[in-house]
Interface confidence: medium
């Protein structure tokens, strides 16, 4: 902490300008009025202050606003935002999307820091839900943002926001997250026609149940193998050979390369060998012809 010292004669700052970069830390502390700094925060970013000088400016703002900065100051923090701790940010009440964008811009190109995560958390909680504009903004800066949320946080995402989601935004989502997102996507895209619907829903299908996959198989969607391999195993198992063939279309040939991997491996074990033979792919491991099929529990089939 900087010691309290009187400001030397003639050095009292009347405005925030470039002359301040020549001030020593103690001079900044003594000669810059915190209220002046707060009203002219937009100028700070244009001045090449050292990290040490920025520490002093932050200290002055902390003294002026011990309960947390007002949004008028937050919006113009610029690089001073990088000096904030998550504890500082938890005191803020950020409601403007413009403020959020301004601060995310400062951190652009870097990993999501704890400061940014706290800022986003405060912003989203303040809004009550993750609306489309916010999601648009966040995924533009952090494509993996959606998948960084817990399933419970994702449950507050309204279906209308799903329109803002791009396939790459779901790359790192796990099954529990897709379980939450899939029904929202299904609702969001329900009024689209077959081929357009499939293009939009494809990235979310890791959360789809069997009945939805059966419905898709009737729509000539030609699902690629990469998407098929991400489907829930328990959703794939009840599909017939004919349904899988319709679902994959020309991509059905790719099953051969994936026959040792889940869910293809487990699905093959549940099919009659003569049904598999109709695909002409040489898939092996189905139920031999003439054998009685017992209704095994799902776990035994999957183990």
């Amino acid at each position: 902490e900087v010691e309290k010292t009187a400001c030397p004669s003639g050095k009292k700052a009347r405005e925030i300008d470039e002359s301040l970069i020549f001030y020593k830390k103690w001079e900044l502390e003594a000669c810059v009025d915190a209220a002046l700094l707060a009203t002219q925060m937009d100028r700070v970013n244009a001045i090449p202050f050292t990290y040490e000088q920025l520490d002093v400016l932050k200290h002055k703002l902390d003294e002026l606003y011990p309960q947390g900065y007002p949004e008028s100051v937050i919006q113009h923090l610029g690089y001073l935002f990088l000096k904030m701790s998550p504890e500082d940010i938890r005191k803020w009440n950020v409601t403007s999307l413009e403020t959020l964008k301004a601060l995310l811009e400062v951190n652009k190109g870097h990993e999501m820091s704890p400061q940014v995560a706290t800022l986003i958390d405060r912003f989203v909680k303040g809004r009550g839900q993750l609306d489309k504009d916010t999601l648009d903004t966040l995924t533009a800066f952090y494509p993996g943002y959606l998948c960084s949320l817990s399933p419970e946080e994702l449950s507050s995402v309204p279906p209308s926001s799903i329109w803002a989601v791009r396939p790459q935004d779901l790359d790192t989502c796990d099954p529990r997250q897709l379980d939450v997102l899939y029904p929202k996507a299904r609702l969001a895209f329900q009024n689209m026609n077959g081929s357009e619907y499939f293009v939009k829903i494809q990235s979310f299908l890791g959360g789809a149940p069997t009945e939805d996959l059966k419905a898709l198989s009737q729509q000539n969607v030609s699902m690629d193998l990469a998407t098929f391999m991400k489907l829930r195993t328990d959703a794939v198992l009840p599909l017939t050979v004919a349904e899988v063939q319709k679902l994959l279309g020309p991509h059905v040939e790719g099953l051969k390369a994936e026959e040792r991997h889940r869910p293809v491996r487990d699905w093959i074990l549940r099919q009659r060998q003569d049904d598999l033979d109709t695909l002409g792919l040489g898939l092996q491991g189905g139920i031999p012809n003439g054998y009685l099929v017992l209704d095994l529990s799902m776990q035994e089939a999957l183990s």
Epitope: T172, C173, M298
Partner: antibody, heavy 120, light 107 residues
Framework: QVQLQESGPGLVKPSETLSLTCTVS????????WSWIRQPPGKGLEWIGY???????NYNPSLKSRVTISVDTSKNQFSLKLSSVTAADTAVYYC??????????????WGQGTLVTVSS | DIQMTQSPSSLSASVGDRVTITCRAS??????LNWYQQKPGKAPKLLIY???SLQSGVPSRFSGSGSGTDFTLTISSLQPEDFATYYC?????????FGGGTKVEIK
């Protein structure tokens, strides 16, 4: 047969960071959730958090500010770090696999557990 | 968070007895309920998943029932190796939570 084995120091000083590793053998670390669960002496089970092989994590809110779980798919290992520990963090720590190809999910394989004592 | 309440916290029974343990969730969890058995110094072992499905290798004297908020684990004829602590666990939403446990002791 899938096996999980916890490793790490059995004694950690207060305010320091507890670090444990779980090595998975007999199966791939892909396509499952890998959890850490703890059990204070004579008490019940508390879920700490899980990681998916993609790196996606989910932590118990009660511990979130102190927990980091990471995964190394090349070594078939995942790890737990719990910072700023106190005596209340003394427990047997288990790593476990959560079955997810079908819903509902459940813990089907567990490590044998490792006792971590927090004491100066 | 979903709270899981188990009852009783402990019970005494004899070999051959029918034992029933109940578990109540603070909100509906569909059938996302699992039961585990834990013996002293050992890790928990899965008995029942999805409320009523018997895990492979678990004796058929163990059974589970229930859906929504109320669930039951039943041991039809208690065996010497069944004396242990039993936990229910919900996997419906995170944080994943366990019941407080029921210790089954020899009468």
């Amino acid at each position: 047969q899938v096996q999980l084995q916890e490793s790490g120091p059995g004694l950690v000083k207060p305010s320091e960071t507890l670090s444990l590793t779980c090595t998975v053998s007999g199966g791939s670390i892909s396509s499952y959730y890998w959890s850490w669960i703890r059990q204070p002496p004579g008490k019940g089970l508390e879920w700490i958090g899980y990681i998916y092989y993609s790196g996606s994590t989910n932590y118990n809110p009660s511990l979130k500010s102190r927990v980091t779980i990471s995964v190394d798919t090349s070594k078939n290992q995942f790890s737990l770090k719990l910072s700023s520990v106190t005596a209340a963090d003394t427990a047997v720590y288990y790593c476990a696999r959560e079955w997810i190809p079908s819903r509902p999910y459940y813990f089907d394989y567990w490590g044998q557990g490792t006792l971590v004592t927090v004491s100066s | 968070d979903i709270q899981m309440t188990q009852s009783p916290s402990s019970l005494s029974a004899s070999v051959g007895d029918r034992v029933t343990i109940t578990c109540r969730a603070s909100q509906s969890i569909s059938s996302y309920l699992n039961w585990y058995q834990q013996k002293p110094g050992k890790a928990p072992k899965l008995l029942i998943y999805a409320a009523s499905s018997l895990q492979s290798g678990v004796p058929s004297r163990f059974s589970g029932s229930g859906s929504g908020t109320d669930f039951t684990l039943t041991i039809s004829s208690l065996q010497p190796e069944d004396f242990a602590t039993y936990y229910c666990q919900q996997s419906y939403s995170t944080p994943l939570t366990f019941g407080g446990g029921t210790k089954v002791e020899i009468k």
